[in-house]
Amino acid sequence: QNLFTKDVTVIEGEVATISCQVNKSDDSVIQLLNPNRQTIYFRDFRPLKDSRFQLLNFSSSELKVSLTNVSISDEGRYFCQLYTDPPQESYTTITVLVPPRNLMIDIQRDTAVEGEEIEVNCTAMASKPATTIRWFKGNTELKGKSEVEEWSDMYTVTSQLMLKVHKEDDGVPVICQVEHPAVTGNLQTQRYLEVQYKPQVHIQMTYPLQGLTREGDALELTCEAIGKPQPVMVTWVRVDDEMPQHAVLSGPNLFINNLNKTDNGTYRCEASNIVGKAHSDYMLYVYDPPTTIPPPTTTTTTTTTTTTTILTIITDSRAGEEGSIRAVDH
């Protein structure tokens, strides 16, 4: 056997080159046939009336033919024949690659609630061979499952991703990325997640700055509530008691002037949105006012004791469960 060919892989619409090569030529006739065994070229003559076939080279050692604007119907075995005694035959297989026609991503719901599992579908239409679909949430790769449909040698792949969403996923892109031998570079489509979540509540003591509350002083607490949608209502209540009459409520702020021991207790900031509600507690303890010492008439030794108050914040934004901010005296 001294007749050789090579298999050809070509992208739809591009040019395929078929080469019939002869080692140790003896000027025998070379012929190229299509998969239906119709003669494309006999020497340098083309009986087949398909002008997409063009002669690139003809000699006693090679018949080289180009096929332009390749379509999927051109796929198959092409036969090289050499009219020696006995005749020789070799075949080359043309494989046509078709990139996906369309890439579509579809999210089950435009807006999801934290903790929900949503289904995201990505469909790569009419490719050959079947497309491999990869999923990413931001930079993290996730695993989807694919269904593959074939019709007329073309494959439509639908990959389904089940995604449990968290509040941190809000605004993060879900990316459907295609891997296919006919696609160079990065073919992908994406949708941004919109995740609704219940408020997170934080209490900040804006006055006094050092965190020690004494009789006669003022107290100012600010409640920060962040959620999606943004909480419309932020309310202050005193747990197990009435709010002091001299307390002033202004939006997220709570002012208590001229503190006294009867103000001791737990003050709660509550916030809610359509997803749920959450709260944070501040435990107020009012200390005695500083004692004033008269100027000494004799020399004395004074020992000063410093009391430090450390603010410990314990926040739990799970709806309906207890959480607290406590001022702990050490």
Epitope: A130, K145, S146, D153, Q160
Partner: antibody, heavy 116, light 108 residues
């Protein structure tokens, strides 16, 4: 109504050859991949080979690669399986099936027995 | 590995629910299909894709999938459901097909 009818099975000696045919009707044959699946007596199903609608792409299980050749004639709505170098463990009922993994239609099968 | 693993035999009381499972690496990427085969007959496709039933298949048959495991559930098993059940899928390369070893379902 989709119909698949296999033929060509029979008794053959080890090392021998056999050609199975599957006549298809009731659907656009050239638009669908086709497959062969076999089942040894008392055993499970084993995928053998598949071919694309145009016949341009063929796929084989490792156990038959190089010995079996799948082909089709879309003008005759017929699928073929050429089996060479047959072995005793190729003994099975051979089914032809529509498409190449979700086998939505099956023939009734043809029995191939490889024995001395 | 490109293998699918099934329990060889499962039994169910008439009218009860039974689940047949299929495990394999390829099921992380592809959905399984399920086939019912009665003695002396060709297999019949009962579930494919995420949970699709071909026409004529009763709605007591359903499919589900998680990780590397696919399940076929028959809710309210009937006497005529007694058969061998096979799962299959594309293998991880996407070019070959793999079958499970089959599960013999007995309806008591």
């Amino acid at each position: 109504e989709v119909q698949l009818v296999e033929s060509g099975g029979g008794l053959v000696q080890p090392g021998g050859s056999l050609r199975l045919s599957c006549a298809a009707s009731g659907f656009t044959f050239s638009s669908y991949a086709m497959s062969w699946v076999r089942q040894a007596p008392g055993k499970g199903l084993e995928w053998v080979s598949a071919i694309s609608g145009s016949g341009g792409s063929t796929y084989y299980a490792d156990s038959v690669k190089g010995r079996f050749t799948i082909s089709r004639d879309n003008s005759k709505n017929t699928l073929y399986l050429q089996m060479n170098s047959l072995r005793a463990k190729d003994t099975a009922v051979y089914y032809c099936a529509k498409t190449n993994w979700n086998f939505d239609y099956w023939g009734q099968g043809t029995l191939v027995t490889v024995s001395r | 590995s490109s293998e699918l693993t099934q329990d060889p035999a499962v039994s169910v009381a008439l009218g009860q629910t039974v689940r047949i499972t299929c495990q394999g690496d390829s099921l992380r990427s592809y959905y399984a299909s399920w086939y019912q085969q009665k003695p002396g007959q060709a297999p019949v496709l009962v579930i494919y894709g995420k949970n699709n039933r071909p026409s004529g298949i009763p709605d007591r048959f359903s499919g589900s999938s998680s990780g590397n495991t696919a399940s076929l559930t028959i809710t309210g098993a009937q006497a005529e459901d007694e058969a061998d059940y096979y799962c299959n899928s594309r293998d991880s390369s996407g070019n070959h097909v793999v079958f499970g070893g089959g599960t013999k379902l007995t309806v008591l």
